[in-house]
Amino acid sequence: VPLSRTVRCTCISISNQPVNPRSLEKLEIIPASQFCPRVEIIATMKKKGEKRCLNPESKAIKNLLKAVSKERSKRSP
């Protein structure tokens, strides 16, 4: 969906629900910028490619980010 000039943030709602890292296809962290003054986290799920906005302040999401970064550091040489 193309964004209008005034709407640059992506997330309309944000989820506090825990996400199973195994169900994740991709996790995008979009830093705050001149276009959107807040960090946005978008999870792409393996199921039907659903994209879900996550709450960066949620404990469950912070734990998910830790788990994902741990997994990445294991994989990197």
Epitope: T10, S13, I14, N16, R38, E50, C53
Partner: antibody, heavy 124, light 109 residues
Framework: QVQLVESGGGVVQPGRSLRLSCAAS????????MHWVRQAPGKGLEWVAV????????SYADSVKGRFTISRDNSKNTLYLQMNSLRAEDTAVYYC?????????????????WGQGTTVTVSS | EIVLTQSPGTLSLSPGERATLSCRAS???????LAWYQQKPGQAPRLLIY???SRATGIPDRFSGSGSGTDFTLTISRLEPEDFAVYYC??????????FGPGTKVDIK
């Protein structure tokens, strides 16, 4: 339980203003986008406006642009619709509705919770 | 602006029968952006389907959604007495803008 309760409807003359409120309870209001949707007597649903969870995203139907303003107060768990320059064609039941959990400009989870509506009648 | 057309306008069926409701868009719509709602007289709408085919929480599995591009379908496999209502499809587009179809009324034959 999860609930949305609209208030502020009534009979108003053309050209006048009215402010609708929607009180939310039973969920974390501050993480959900919110909508106003209306339904004229005997007609279908018409989307009016949306506001993102933090108020940064706002959008309006062409039919109300420049006349209606959507806003929210997350500290009061309340959504508002300020309606100015009202016309006879604005007569309808106005519903507030919650945007689904985690909706973004890339994936839409639908309006998953609705209030029972408040009636606005614009008549001289 | 994308326009949604629903057909038929009214569907007269008996309990136990299968209902097939159509929603056609004037331009291609991503299935990620299509939802279906049910509305009974004097009540608020209820979300049935999002993402064209995912059932909302608490929706019975007799309701299913399908389709892509410009043609989408809501199927009720076996009509129960409580399913007689008006059904709306809805599309989410740029800006963001949310558009409803005109509705299909499912009534008792």
């Amino acid at each position: 339980q999860v609930q949305l309760v609209e208030s502020g409807g009534g009979v108003v003359q053309p050209g006048r203003s009215l402010r609708l409120s929607c009180a939310a309870s039973g969920f974390t209001f501050s993480t959900h986008g919110m909508h106003w949707v209306r339904q004229a007597p005997g007609k279908g649903l018409e989307w009016v406006a949306v506001i993102g969870f933090g108020g940064l995203i706002k959008s309006y139907a062409d039919s109300v642009k420049g006349r209606f303003t959507i806003s929210r107060d997350n500290s009061k768990n309340t959504l508002y619709l300020q309606m100015n320059s009202l016309r006879a064609e604005d007569t309808a039941v106005y519903y507030c509705a919650r945007e689904g959990d985690g909706s973004s400009l890339y994936f839409y989870y639908g309006m998953d919770v609705w209030g029972q509506g408040t009636t606005v009648t614009v008549s001289s | 602006e994308i326009v949604l057309t629903q057909s038929p306008g009214t569907l007269s069926l008996s309990p136990g029968e299968r209902a097939t409701l159509s929603c056609r868009a004037s331009q291609s719509v991503s299935s990620s952006y299509l939802a279906w709602y049910q509305q009974k007289p004097g009540q608020a709408p209820r979300l049935l389907i999002y993402g064209a085919s995912s059932r909302a929480t608490g929706i019975p599995d007799r309701f299913s959604g399908s389709g892509s591009g410009t043609d989408f379908t809501l199927t009720i496999s076996r009509l129960e007495p409580e399913d007689f209502a008006v059904y709306y499809c809805q599309q989410y587009g740029s800006s963001p803008i949310f558009t409803f179809g005109p509705g299909t009324k499912v009534d008792i034959k």
